[in-house]
């Protein structure tokens, strides 16, 4: 698995999105967790619904919510009150029984409020940004800029 | 094992440039903010500048803002300092420092320093 | 950019003591602080982030706490590898450090 990289502002609400297969993982619960380090196991922070045919209701734990769209194939994770300490790497998984699969392995990078911090260089609309492959950062949005291109406008 | 090594100090004249490179292995580099960090002779630590996983994000102590420039190459594993129309109190270790995971805001690894003295 | 001041600026102590070093903003800090130990001739180390938390590798003698503006470091028992001069961090606000306490033999 690649490892995208979804940008967020401190005090600010970040959106996750995992694309998958709608057919492949129907009837099949949803989890975000949270890795512990680059290679420690996964602590579930949220799952969907118990009742799959529910899924699309949303649900809490903390500041941390998850929805799926099991017909289109997204499942939606919402950070609210970004903090510096969520930062980190994260798994969306799909259950089936004791087991679960990676839909996708996202790192959400905190970065300062701009209004805090007004000598922010090249500061843009925070989302899905960048991926990471097997160490190696792809061509994408955040290397444009670094580059010195026109941002793109946040995937949604 | 985690290693943050600092290059590129030295002596240099008030007004000239420096370019400090800080090289690290034992950790998958792109998934870290990154910033260094000074300290000049006996004195205290001092945040210099800050910089996102992908580059895109830069951030920098007023006293350094316009004259000092922070970049990764992540291709490398590598941090880079530019500092450009140095000041006598621009002399201090430079330390790379790693962040966590996604981000810059503390610093779980300290690299050894590197010197640079700026004097006529 | 918050101001942090640290007391006292050397304390002197002995092994075994209980030492508490003390560190104070000139604004809230919301609990984004961190504690450094730097040795002579040695890079900084991360102790403590986010108040209380425990870097991985450090010892349990070492704790943190505070809230607001007012934050401490406290050691349990004193080992003669604890001198050393320690900084608080904060990140709530910008980035700044105290002015450290050095902390040597009685």
């Known amino acids: 698995h690649n490892t995208t990289v979804f940008q967020g502002v401190a005090g600010q609400s970040l959106q996750v999105s995992c694309p998958y297969d709608s057919m492949k993982h129907w009837g099949r619960r949803k989890a975000w967790c949270r890795q512990l380090g680059e290679k420690g196991p996964c602590q579930r922070v949220v799952s969907t619904h118990n009742l799959w045919l529910l899924s699309f209701l949303r649900r809490w734990n903390g500041s941390t919510a998850i929805t799926d769209d099991t017909l289109g194939g997204t499942l939606t994770i919402t950070l609210r009150n970004l903090q510096p300490h969520d930062a980190g790497l994260y798994q969306c998984q799909s259950l089936h029984g004791s087991e679960a699969d990676t839909l996708r392995k996202v790192l959400v990078e905190v970065l300062a409020d701009p209004l805090d911090h007004r000598d922010a260089g090249d500061l843009w609309f925070p989302g899905e940004s960048e991926s990471f492959e097997d160490a190696h950062v792809e061509h994408s949005i955040s290397r444009s800029l670094l580059e010195g291109e026109i941002p793109f406008p946040p995937t949604s | 094992e985690v290693q943050l090594v600092e290059s590129g100090g030295g002596l240099v004249q008030p007004g000239k440039s420096l370019k400090l490179s800080c090289a690290a292995s034992g950790f998958t580099f792109s998934y870290y903010g990154m910033a260094w960090v000074r300290q000049a002779p006996t004195k205290g630590l001092e945040w210099v500048a800050s910089?996102?996983?992908?580059?895109?994000?830069?951030y920098y102590r007023d006293s350094v803002k316009g004259r000092f420039t922070i970049s990764r190459g992540n291709a490398k594993n590598t941090l880079y300092l530019q500092m450009d129309s140095l000041r006598s109190e621009d002399t201090a270790t430079y330390y790379c420092?790693?962040?966590?995971?996604?981000?810059?805001?503390?610093?779980?690894?300290w690299g050894q320093g590197t010197l640079v003295t700026v004097s006529s | 950019d918050i101001q942090l001041t640290q007391s006292p600026s050397l304390l002197s102590a002995s092994v075994g003591d209980r030492v508490t070093l003390s560190c104070k903003g000139s604004?809230?800090?919301?609990?984004?602080l961190a504690w450094y130990q730097q040795k002579l001739g040695e890079a900084p180390k991360l102790l403590i982030y986010?108040?209380?938390s425990l870097q991985t590798g450090i010892p349990s003698r070492f704790s943190g706490s505070g809230s607001g503006t007012d934050y401490t470091l406290t050691i349990s028992s004193l080992h003669s590898e604890d001198l050393a001069t320690y900084y608080c961090y904060q990140y709530n606000n910008g980035w700044t450090f105290g002015g450290g306490t050095k902390l040597e033999l009685k």
């Open positions: 910089i996102s996983t992908g580059g895109g994000n830069t």
């Open positions: 986010k108040t209380n």
């Open positions: 420092a790693r962040g966590d995971i996604g981000t810059s805001y503390w610093f779980t690894y």
């Open positions: 604004q809230t800090i919301n609990n984004y």
